[in-house]
Structure formats: structure tokens, C-alpha cells
Amino acid sequence: SLRGRDAPAPTPCVPAECFDLLVRHCVACGLLRTPRPKPAGASSPAPRTALQPQESVGAGAGEAA
């Protein structure tokens, strides 16, 4: 899983934003519910899809300079 160091509880975001569970910041709510890929052929493994949100906690995030 993407568990990192202990992170604070999600901070409230303004209505136009969503709390990103990886970067631990409010971000613009992007594409809602990205469509799942179709099963891949036998020649290649199927792409991974969404991790469970509770497992999507990343390490510390830093903004770009």
C-alpha cells in the first residue's frame, strides 16, 4: 500500500476542491471516477485500478518552488 508516515486528518476543502489522499492537500476536483480500463489481453497484465482510499496515504508532500 501507499502508507507513509502518520499524516494529519484531512483538512476541510472549499467546495470546488477535493482532498487528495496521496498528496495530503486540497486540489481541484479533477476527472470524477476515471473510467476503468477493459481487461487486457493474455499477452499483458491488466492495468491496476484504484487503490482503496484508506490505503492511499503518501509520504510528506512538498509544493513546487
Epitope: 489522499l21 479533477g30 476527472l31 513546487a64
Partner: nanobody, 121 residues
Framework: EVQLVESGGGVVQPGRSLRLTCAAS????????MYWIRQAPGKGLEWVSY????????YYADSVKGRFTISRDNSKNTLYLQMNSLRAEDTAVYYC??????????????WGQGTTVTVSS
Amino acid sequence: EVQLVESGGGVVQPGRSLRLTCAASGFTFSTSGMYWIRQAPGKGLEWVSYISSSSSTIYYADSVKGRFTISRDNSKNTLYLQMNSLRAEDTAVYYCVTQSCGAGKCYPGVWGQGTTVTVSS
């Protein structure tokens, strides 16, 4: 069909640079935030960087801040990761991942197949 195809990985010496590319198709790339996430051999997944749909918001993990640069070209449906001053600990499979949002939260959505970066002298 959503497709993410990473390229640009390879074997490189410490201190050198690589540029990873992710070609996206099958969804509206220009409205989707994107992540780079990596997995080192025998280790768990580690988030590397995030870029918003318009490139106005960018975040980096502490481990790569100042060395890696994420960017995107929405006209080409392409995501990039410029990796400079590479270290042995950057050795990993690098995945291009869409951001999926719902119920006020965002999290990883669809993953590419990954491209392998090996930093070794």
C-alpha cells in the same frame, strides 16, 4: 479504453538524468490530475509527484524535491517526469497514474504498466 503507456526508463549511472514519458489515451487527459508513483524492488509503493490538470498545482515527495520535475502537455496527451541527480535509491518501476475523484476526495485511478529505472554504477 483507458491506456497509459510509460517509456524512457533504463539503466543510468548515479548523478545522471532520465526523462520518463507517459502517453495517455481513452479519457479526457486535459481535465485529469496525474501522479507518478514508484515501487522499488522488494518495497512498497511510493508516491513521487502530482500535477493538476492545468499544471497550476504541483507537489513532490520530499525524497525527490529539487531533483525531479513533473510536467504535462495537454495538446499531446502526455505526462513527463524529468529526473536529475539520480541516486541508487531512485531505482524502481515508475508508474503513470490517473487521479480519480469522488465524494470530496481524490486518489489513484488507472495505472500504466510501468517503466523500470535502474541507477547503478
